[in-house]
């Protein structure tokens, strides 16, 4: 019976134990439920061992315990003695759960101690969680505001841009107009001298003279005034272009030619002539402009193919294969005539083009353009 | 010697698109450019569209922007007009022109025959 | 966007009478200005360019004139093949090209 009574009050000191360590109910309240079961149970203990004495005193006093043999006396002292060490084990295991009583109240003040700090913190974070969503959606309405307004103003850059294009397109139309006024002024001033007159009467046949040492190949001459009409021969490859060489000793007078063809009735001539220089072939390199007496080149800003098309063909090739960009066959030497030259393509030469601007410092010669044309 | 040979006319409902054709010959399409010209029934001529080499692009008259596309196909040197949304307003002969720069204004020497489109319910 | 305005719309005159018609800018478009000639069921066909510039194969008898805002095609001495609708076209302004709204030269 004992045994099965301190079994059950083991167990419930678990339960109490267990309740105890996690927290269940009011800290303070437990503690003390789990002191007085504590305590009860011992002097339930006590009384029970005090119990257990007084038999044992009834019974040496009884005669029917004098009969006993020694091996009974022997058994109960052995019993006492289980008994005393199981009490100072008790008393043992009550000083161990004082300990741990101790240590639970220390702990729970520090729980209590977490708690509130944890509880302020939480405060903090919530308050600080707020404000931030205030910030948050204060900066939305910022973002927002200032979305519309990029909106805006990049609508207002757009019909900007298109009222710039058109300004820049109407003041160069007006340089453009100017330059070829001026241009028109100084022709007209140059052609004062270039006007040509009727065809002279026809001379007498002059004998053939002998013909002349021929020197080395020199620059092309001015075109001479046309001879017989002959078969037209394959255009043959433009020899590289030799250097100058003496003027040989003039030949007597030749016979006297047909009639030539009625000339086109225009005193002007192209203020442009334009050359191939550093290709492979005459049919390409870097394109050259005759212009004001002297030959420059052409930058690249907006060279493509239609501009090429245009200097193919005015130099007789059918069209253009490719068009180059940065100094693709060397730079050259000397002006950059024109920086920005459009063209739609059915021009008969670069001078029908829209040139910008003739004489450009907004370029170098690494920006040289050049063509090749078809053959 | 430009020649621009437009395809046949058509008739179109309310609402469709129509794509007209422009042939190139004599030229390729890549060393030319092709602007698109449209003359309604008894009425003047009104530009379209077409390359600019200023803006180095195609541009629009604002009339037509969003309505009209203008592509090319260099294989067969043909250029193409496509106009969408129609209505009876857009009835009209369509022309595709090539333009030269003479003396720094754009002019307009070859013509194609032109195509009469009819937007009819 | 420039507007073009031509006048008269339309006009009457015989074979061999000397006809001008006029074509005004709503501001200065320099010499950027073209004459164009339409027949009946036909393209367009460019006579003048750069306001006074003879386009190649086109007859002196047509001739152009004029700077700024004011511009003028004269036919010296008409021929019966003149007998057409003629535009005036501006590109100084661009994009848009812009024509004029046409004169149609009849038959008196």
């Known amino acids: 019976k004992w045994e099965t009574k301190n079994c059950s009050v083991s167990s419930t000191n678990a339960n109490d134990i267990t309740q105890s360590l996690t927290g269940k109910g009011n800290d303070s309240e437990e503690e003390m439920r789990f002191q007085e079961v504590f305590m009860e149970h011992m002097s339930n203990m006590e009384k029970r061992i005090q119990h257990i004495l007084d038999m044992e005193a009834n019974l040496m006093d009884t005669e029917h315990f004098q009969n006993f043999s020694m091996t009974t006396d022997q058994r109960f002292n052995d019993i006492l003695l289980q008994l005393s060490t199981l009490f100072s084990s008790v008393q043992g295991h009550g000083n161990a759960i004082d300990e741990i009583s101790k240590s639970l109240i220390s702990l729970n003040t520090t729980l209590l101690d977490l708690q509130l700090n944890i509880e302020n913190l939480n405060g903090k974070i919530q308050e600080n969680t707020f404000k931030q969503q205030e910030e948050i959606s204060k900066l939305e309405e910022r973002v927002y505001n200032v979305s519309a307004e990029i909106m805006a103003m990049k609508e207002e850059q757009v019909h900007l841009e298109q009222e710039i294009k058109g300004e820049v397109k109407v003041l160069n139309n007006i340089t453009n107009d100017l330059r070829l006024k001026d241009w028109e002024h100084s022709q007209t001033l140059r052609n004062i001298t270039l006007i040509q007159g009727p065809p002279g009467p026809p001379g007498e046949k002059g004998d053939r003279g002998p013909t002349g040492e021929s020197g080395p190949r020199g620059f092309p001459g001015p075109i001479g005034p046309p001879g017989l009409k002959g078969d037209r021969g394959a255009i043959g490859f433009p020899g590289s272009r030799g250097l100058p060489g003496y003027a040989g000793r003039p030949g007597n007078s030749g016979p006297k030619g047909q009639k030539g063809e009625k000339g086109s009735g225009n005193t002007l001539t192209p203020f442009t002539k334009v050359r191939l220089v550093g290709g492979s072939g005459p049919h390409e390199g870097r394109v050259e402009i005759l212009h004001s007496g002297q030959w420059g080149t052409i930058c690249d800003d907006r060279w493509e193919v239609r501009v090429g098309q245009v200097v193919c063909r005015s130099l007789g090739y059918p069209g253009v294969q490719a068009v180059h960009k940065a100094a693709h066959f060397g730079q050259g030497t000397g002006p950059i005539w024109l920086n920005e030259v459009f063209c739609f393509g059915r021009e008969s030469s670069i001078e029908e083009c829209k040139i910008r601007q003739w004489g450009t410092r907004a370029c170098s010669h690494s920006e040289d353009a050049g063509v090749t044309c078809t053959l | 010697q430009v020649q621009l040979v437009q395809s046949g006319a058509e008739v179109r409902e309310p609402g469709a698109s129509v794509k007209l054709s422009c042939k190139v010959s004599?030229?390729?399409?890549?060393?030319?450019?092709i602007h698109w010209v449209r003359q309604a029934p008894g009425k003047g001529l009104e530009w379209m569209g077409g390359?600019?080499?200023?803006?180095?692009?195609?541009v629009y008259a604002q009339k037509f922007r969003g309505r009209v596309t203008l592509t090319e196909d260099i294989s067969p040197d043909t250029a193409y007009m496509e106009l969408s949304s129609l209505t009876s307003e857009d009835t009209a002969v369509y022309y595709c022109?090539?333009?030269?720069?003479?003396?720094?204004?754009?002019?307009?020497?070859?013509w194609g025959q032109g195509t009469l489109i009819t937007v009819s319910s | 966007d420039i507007q073009m305005t031509q006048s008269p719309s339309s006009l009457s005159a015989s074979v061999g009478d000397r006809v001008t018609i006029t074509c005004r800018a709503s501001?200065?478009?320099?010499?950027?200005l073209n004459w164009y000639q339409q027949k009946p069921g036909k393209a367009p066909k460019l006579l003048i360019y750069?306001?006074?510039s003879l386009q190649s194969g086109v007859p002196s008898r047509f001739s152009g004139s004029g700077s700024g805002t004011d511009f003028t095609l004269t036919i010296s001495s008409l021929q019966p093949e003149d007998f057409a609708t003629y535009y005036c076209?501006?590109?100084?302004?661009?994009?848009?090209?812009?024509f004029g709204q046409g004169t149609r030269l009849e038959i008196k």
């Open positions: 076209q501006q590109s100084y302004s661009t994009p848009p090209i812009t």
């Open positions: 022109a090539t333009p030269r720069y003479c003396n720094n204004g754009i002019c307009y020497d070859y």
């Open positions: 750069a306001a006074s």
């Open positions: 501001q200065s478009i320099s010499s950027y």
């Open positions: 390359f600019d080499p200023e803006e180095g692009e195609t």
């Open positions: 004599g030229y390729t399409l890549t060393e030319l450019s």
